[in-house]
Interface confidence: low
Amino acid sequence: GITIPRNPGCPNSEDKNFPRTVMVNLNIHNRNTNTNPKRSSDYYNRSTSPWNLHRNEDPERYPSVIWEAKCRHLGCINADGNVDYHMNSVPIQQEILVLRREPPHCPNSFRLEKILVSVGCTCVTPIVHHVA
Amino acid sequence: GITIPRNPGCPNSEDKNFPRTVMVNLNIHNRNTNTNPKRSSDYYNRSTSPWNLHRNEDPERYPSVIWEAKCRHLGCINADGNVDYHMNSVPIQQEILVLRREPPHCPNSFRLEKILVSVGCTCVTPIVHHVA
């Protein structure tokens, strides 16, 4: 990789080791300016593996509210609108970074935390185990 | 909700306003200890809306590597293994938080940033616009 020279205008830091405590500006910069806000808001209903969105709230976490997807069916919706159990609705999961207040209840001190969230569901062919 | 008293052991903060700069410990705590790491590793191939994973790397971002899903087909895979263009493969997108070095190239100063990533694909019924 390229070695990027350190910016001389950086704030001072007493601890240069990793893991380390860093300063983070919580004024979120949004890079998604060109996206359509309604981009995927109805996929949860139109999908052959539809899902519901459940609210997950934790005041000790930043962001405090996250929406979790739960697949509606074990099977997938076929062309007739019925559930086909020869296929499986499965959650697509992703690990995301959140900030956890540490020590607890502190407004200005956090620890980076990795959590697993279900973002939506997809329809997959099941793995069939044949008995010999 | 319960009003949680402020922990007396919290670090001092000169700026109690929001948006604000906070201290963040980058030693990541992983809450996903009980999950199977192979949980959805093959869904991208078994899905009726399969996808490829592309590596997105940015040394000024934390985490520096993010994997992006790209749907393989416009349509979805039917029971015969062919692409059915009466259905659509669409990306499931999620907004995630990352840390952006600010000022650039600083090892210990970041700004919270929100980026949109495609996590996987799902098969949806298309919206058909009927011409009057």
């Epitope: 806000p37 929406w67 979790e68 | 999620q94 929100k114």
Partner: nanobody, 119 residues
Framework: EVQLVESGGGLVQPGGSLRLSCATS????????MYWVRQAPGKGLEWVAE????????YYVDSVKGRFTISRDNAKNSLYLQMNSLRAEDTAVYYC????????????WGQGTLVTVSS
């Protein structure tokens, strides 16, 4: 440029009422869920209430259920919070915020309006 401007805060006695307003501009208001969030003195942020794009669904934190009502007027690009039966513990700076789904993060905030409940 996205702007959210809160108003309607002030000093009120316990049991009293206030109506907060949030005037917005710079984005398609009717396409977004909107939120009220508050920060009490020396405390962290607390989500208070949210309303979906068309106003069909509303959520409240337990401590304000039955006392606060969130509403919106998409024609006026405005968000409101009717606060009744106010308590001392409702004292905080109230922010309106614009958000997204999957998952939900607040991306824009107003400057806040201070609500003080005291006798």
């Amino acid at each position: 440029e996205v702007q959210l401007v809160e108003s309607g805060g002030g000093l009120v006695q316990p049991g009293g009422s206030l109506r907060l307003s949030c005037a917005t501009s710079g984005f398609t208001f009717s396409s977004y869920g909107m939120y009220w969030v508050r920060q009490a003195p020396g405390k962290g942020l607390e989500w208070v209430a949210e309303i979906k794009q068309d106003g069909s669904e509303k959520y409240y934190v337990d401590s304000v259920k039955g006392r606060f009502t969130i509403s919106r007027d998409n024609a006026k690009n405005s968000l409101y919070l009717q606060m009744n039966s106010l308590r001392a513990e409702d004292t905080a700076v109230y922010y309106c915020a614009k958000g997204e789904i999957l998952p939900l993060y607040f991306d824009y905030w107003g400057q806040g309006t201070l609500v003080t409940v005291s006798s």
